[in-house]
């Protein structure tokens, strides 16, 4: 907290500019009008203020807006955003995707922080659902975002938003999350033709049931082993040797290298040895 002192003669700030970097903390407190600061927030980031000076500027904004900053100020916070606490951010009402992007840009390249998490939560709750543009933005900054949501939260994602999801956005999802996302993806991509459909649905297949895998095996999809290894064990177990051979196509030879790992290991144990022998891979059931 900075003491209230009168502004020295001739030092009253007329605008937010470079001259303010030479002001001591108490001079900033006394000589910079909070309303002026709020209207010229976009200039703050161009000026190399010290962290201590930024603390003073934040304090002035807090006094001006005790109930939370308006979006016009939030959008131009820039590096001052890093000074905000989750408690500060919970007072905000951020509705513009541009504001969200501007603040995420400040934290770019860093791990998710409590401040960013609070900001995202406030934004998404305000929107009511995770629309495509929001999801696009969040996964661009944080590829692990989608897989950090609970199955319950994911259930409110509309199928139309699935178009924004890239394969790498699903890398850290668990089977429970994919169980929720897969039916949405199936719905979103239902009008695509066979090969295009497989390219899009492939990264969601960790949530696919047996009957869908059987259907895919009839479509010459040539699923790679990496995708096969991510399938649900309970969905793979009922597949016949012939169906797995059709599903994997030329990649079927890769089963040998994975014979000790799930789901391949469990699937092998369910098959008749005679059927496994037809693959010519030396798999032992």
């Amino acid at each position: 907290e900075v003491e209230k002192t009168a502004c020295p003669s001739g030092k009253k700030a007329r605008e937010i500019d470079e001259s303010l970097i030479f002001y001591k903390k108490w001079e900033l407190e006394a000589c910079v009008d909070a309303a002026l600061l709020a209207t010229q927030m976009d200039r703050v980031n161009a000026i190399p203020f010290t962290y201590e000076q930024l603390d003073v500027l934040k304090h002035k904004l807090d006094e001006l807006y005790p109930q939370g900053y308006p979006e016009s100020v939030i959008q131009h916070l820039g590096y001052l955003f890093l000074k905000m606490s989750p408690e500060d951010i919970r007072k905000w009402n951020v509705t513009s995707l541009e504001t969200l992007k501007a603040l995420l840009e400040v934290n770019k390249g860093h791990e998710m922080s409590p401040q960013v998490a609070t900001l995202i939560d406030r934004f998404v709750k305000g929107r009511g659902q995770l629309d495509k543009d929001t999801l696009d933005t969040l996964t661009a900054f944080y590829p692990g975002y989608l897989c950090s949501l609970s199955p319950e939260e994911l259930s409110s994602v509309p199928p139309s938003s699935i178009w924004a999801v890239r394969p790498q956005d699903l890398d850290t999802c668990d089977p429970r999350q994919l169980d929720v996302l897969y039916p949405k993806a199936r719905l979103a991509f239902q009008n695509m033709n066979g090969s295009e459909y497989f390219v899009k649905i492939q990264s969601f297949l960790g949530g696919a049931p047996t009957e869908d895998l059987k259907a895919l095996s009839q479509q010459n999809v040539s699923m790679d082993l990496a995708t096969f290894m991510k399938l649900r064990t309970d969905a793979v177990l009922p597949l016949t040797v012939a169906e797995v051979q059709k599903l994997l196509g030329p990649h079927v030879e890769g089963l040998k290298a994975e014979e000790r790992h799930r789901p391949v290991r469990d699937w092998i144990l369910r098959q008749r040895q005679d059927d496994l022998d037809t693959l010519g891979l030396g798999l032992q059931g």
């Epitope: 998710m112 998490a117 950090s148 850290t172 668990d174």
Partner: nanobody, 119 residues
Framework: QVQLVESGGGSVQAGGSLRLSCAAS??????MGWFRRAPGKAREEVAT???????YYANSVEGRFTASRNNAENTLSLEMNSLNAEDTAMYYC???????????????WGQGTQVTVSS
């Protein structure tokens, strides 16, 4: 680098209760969970708790164990009731900074805390 420190393990009679705690250094946006390993057995997922507080439990502990987390303090707890001899194991806290897949790299593990239930 995230570090996880568990506490609260110990010995208890069958039918008794214990509360395990886990404190994380560093911010956890992804899942947190409890795993256990009994002598001679494979590691078993006990509970996974998502950031919104939704928890999923292994069938063997459903209704007896309750997991909760505090996102602001980066802590996780496991309330264990009606303990039996089969619950004897080393219990490990796990966390991901983002995401929830325990089977791929990026999982942080605690050192573990021993729980022993005698009948």
């Amino acid at each position: 680098q995230v570090q996880l420190v568990e506490s609260g393990g110990g010995s208890v009679q069958a039918g008794g209760s214990l509360r395990l705690s886990c404190a994380a250094s560093g911010y956890i946006y992804g899942c947190m969970g409890w795993f256990r390993r009994a002598p001679g057995k494979a590691r078993e997922e006990v509970a996974t708790i998502y950031r919104d507080g939704t928890a999923y439990y292994a069938n063997s502990v459903e209704g007896r164990f309750t997991a909760s987390r505090n996102n602001a303090e980066n802590t996780l707890s496991l309330e264990m009731n009606s303990l039996n001899a089969e619950d004897t194991a080393m219990y490990y806290c796990a966390a991901r900074t983002t995401g929830c897949n325990w089977d791929i790299s990026g999982v942080y593990w605690g050192q573990g805390t021993q729980v022993t239930v005698s009948s």
